[in-house]
């Protein structure tokens, strides 16, 4: 229903704490360079204004849209042009163009230093002094580095953070309590970020229909006992929630997500038998839990898919009558039977089925033409299954770091023009798929691997879009989202690439590497590996292994030496010579 004051409506629905958190996230995602204090001031002003509207919905400006109110606040920031350049031009536009302009200026790779975690004692001190400010800093720092982070989910992670600090700061050994727990939250939050970015990309590039198809497949896998009408309703609502969050309408998004969670918990009987545990939790935990709830048990008596979609005489008639509904029921029926497939694969199968009907229903004898469609799915299913087997075997053999290196070599050969930091980031993320998915039961591996890889490759595409350098990458990124992963997998060595000349300084290291944390050491070594491949794109795995082993040995020796600096300056040049010889 329409409300006299949108801001009062949202404040009442969400409550002050969530309202303030969401406004802070919104501002931090739009203006990524502003400090926490600048944003906190704006948030307080907006909150005070919302309270006046709650007291009197007819008060001045209370009838304005949220975009107008928030946009006016952002545009009133001093030195906007100095700090944000052409983003300031957005302020010359009217709504809704102004908000669209802000969205277009969101930066997926802002030049901000990595978010460093303070040491335990300092963290606990500032948390105890002012928990609200501490959590505000967390929201601000994450939101500005991840401008499409799913806002209500970020509130959930902040709540997790809060609970961990409350528990661990009371312990004697704060460090060993905090580190593993916060690392776990960070890992989950980073995965959540790339997954949500993929959803926003789907929405931005291919529209609501594409996202809704994704949702139908995903929901049908999770709730195989729900009927098509129920799945369609959930998919429609989920599409609305994601459209709002991707569009910067974070208050509406969080409010609608809470409504959807409420609806699901009130209608468990027609959705799934697995929801009760989630529904017993408070709001943020409930919505999070529902988003990753285990699959319900599949009905035992499902007829073969062929009955309605191949053998039925009415296939083309049903398709003609309502294409989207018929394809939607196909996607629903196929997905509920295959929780062991990735959503990307299910969407490829639905696309293949659609293409088959488009071709066959135009023929004189359609049944003879589409009769073999299910058999034609086989290669599409085998390809990702083989990918999972090959990569999990490799991961089990090499471990995470070695697996990342194998991927780094492979992707540097596919797209050597891409910057080394981007290749290293991508390979490290892609390599984590092993730890994340290869340890799962067989029937969960494929969906885990492929949907995770698709999300990571989406980030590769977004970064490459900013500065396109590789035709290979451009080709894979300009196709449909579900075809990206197979496209990247099929890429081979880029024959057009002119190898980089060998620069000794690229492979020159100093004693400061010895004191770096393990992760930073790995990144340094992986940077060198990517540069080696750029110098010799056709180097064999054996040659690269020889060089990297030598390099590891060199680091080990010099880092243990009494006079590290001398070791690095004398042994370093010898290492460079040996590397050149090994790759000659």
């Amino acid at each position: 229903e329409a409300h006299k004051s949108e801001i009062a409506h949202r404040y009442n629905d969400l409550g002050e704490q969530h309202f303030k958190g969401l406004v802070l996230i919104a501002f931090s995602q739009y203006l990524q360079k502003c400090s926490y204090d600048e944003h906190a001031k704006l948030v307080q002003e907006v909150t005070d204004f919302a309270k006046t509207c709650v007291a009197d919905e007819s008060a001045a400006n209370c009838d304005k849209s949220l975009h107008t109110l928030f946009g006016d606040k952002l545009c009133a920031i001093p030195n906007l042009r100095e700090n944000y350049g052409e983003l300031a031009d957005c302020c010359t536009k009217q709504e809704p163009e102004r908000n669209e302009c802000f969205l277009q200026h969101k930066d997926d790779n802002p030049s901000l230093p990595p978010f460093e975690r303070p040491e335990a004692e300092a963290m606990c001190t500032s948390f105890k002094e002012n928990p609200t400010t501490f959590m505000g800093h967390y929201l601000h720092e994450v939101a500005r580095r991840h401008p499409y982070f799913y806002a209500p989910e970020l509130l959930y992670y902040a709540e997790q953070y809060n609970e961990i600090l409350t528990q661990c700061c009371a312990e004697a050994d704060k460090e060993s309590c905090l580190t593993p727990k916060l690392d776990g939250v960070k890992e989950k939050a980073l995965v959540s970020s790339v997954r949500q970015r993929m959803k926003c990309s789907s929405m931005q590039k291919f529209g609501e229909r594409a996202f809704k198809a994704w949702a139908v497949a995903r929901l049908s896998q999770t709730f195989p006992n729900a009927d098509f009408a129920e799945i369609t309703k959930l998919a429609t609502d989920l599409t609305k929630v994601n459209k709002e969050c991707c569009h910067g309408d974070l208050l509406e998004c969080a409010d609608d997500r809470a409504e959807l969670a409420k609806y699901m918990c009130e209608n468990q009987a027609t959705i799934s038998s697995k929801l009760q545990t989630c529904c017993d939790k408070p709001l943020l935990k409930k919505a999070h839990c529902l988003s990753e709830v285990e699959h319900d048990t599949m009905p035992a008596d499902l007829p073969a898919i062929a009955a309605d979609f191949v053998e039925d005489q009415e296939v083309c008639k049903n398709y003609a009558e309502a294409k989207d509904v018929f394809l939607g029921t196909f996607l629903y029926e196929y997905s509920r039977r295959h929780p062991d497939y990735s959503v990307s694969l299910l969407l490829r199968l639905a696309k293949k089925y659609e293409a088959t009907l488009e071709k066959c229903c135009a023929e004189a004898n359609p049944p003879a033409c589409y009769g073999t469609v299910l058999a034609e799915f086989q290669p599409l299913v085998e390809e990702p299954k083989n990918l999972v087997k090959t990569n999990c075997d490799l991961y089990e053999k090499l471990g995470e770091y070695g697996f990342q290196n194998a991927i780094l070599v492979r992707y540097t050969q596919k797209a050597p023009q891409v910057s080394t930091p981007t290749l290293v980031e991508a390979a490290r993320n892609l390599g984590r798929v092993g730890t994340k998915c290869c340890t799962l039961p067989e029937d969960q591996r494929l969906p885990c691997v492929e949907d995770y890889l698709s999300a990571i490759l989406n980030r590769v595409c977004l970064l490459h879009e900013k500065t396109p350098v590789s035709e290979h990458v451009t080709k894979c990124c300009s196709g449909s989202l579900v075809e990206r992963r197979p496209c990247f997998s099929a890429l081979t060595v880029d024959e057009t690439y002119v190898p980089k000349e060998f620069k000794a300084e690229t492979f020159t290291f100093h004693s400061d590497i010895c004191t770096l944390p393990e992760k930073e050491k790995q990144i340094k070594k992986q940077t060198a590996l990517a540069e080696l491949v750029k110098h010799k794109p056709k180097a064999t795995a054996e040659q690269l292994k020889t060089v990297m082993d030598d390099f590891a040995q060199f680091l080990d020796t010099c880092c243990k030496a009494a006079d590290k600096d001398t070791c690095f300056s004398t042994e370093g040049p010898n290492l460079v010579t040996r590397c050149k010889d090994a790759l000659a």
Epitope: Q313, C316, K317, A320, C361, A362, E363, A364, N365
Partner: nanobody, 115 residues
Amino acid sequence: EVQLVESGGGVVQPGNSLRLSCAASGFTFSSFGMSWVRQAPGKGLEWVSSISGSGSDTLYADSVKGRFTISRDNAKTTLYLQMNSLRPEDTALYYCTIGGSLSRSSQGTLVTVSS
């Protein structure tokens, strides 16, 4: 909403001709193959003829081959069946259908061949 409306049926003597029409609406006509099926009194549905969406490809039941011609006008979204040398056994309700469908989703048009 898909609509198929047949017309052109009637009573004719054996050896004569009739031309049936089927006006289609509610879907992309040119993207779909179309068929004629018939149901003689007290019998089941029998497939008669089919044509591809472009009109370039046609198929006929042995019982009508050489006597009937299926065609279409995609601009008018209309399907036709030219029936020559009609026989008493061609007496039936004739339906047009989408794709290879053997079903009656329309009223049909009655063809009676009798001396």
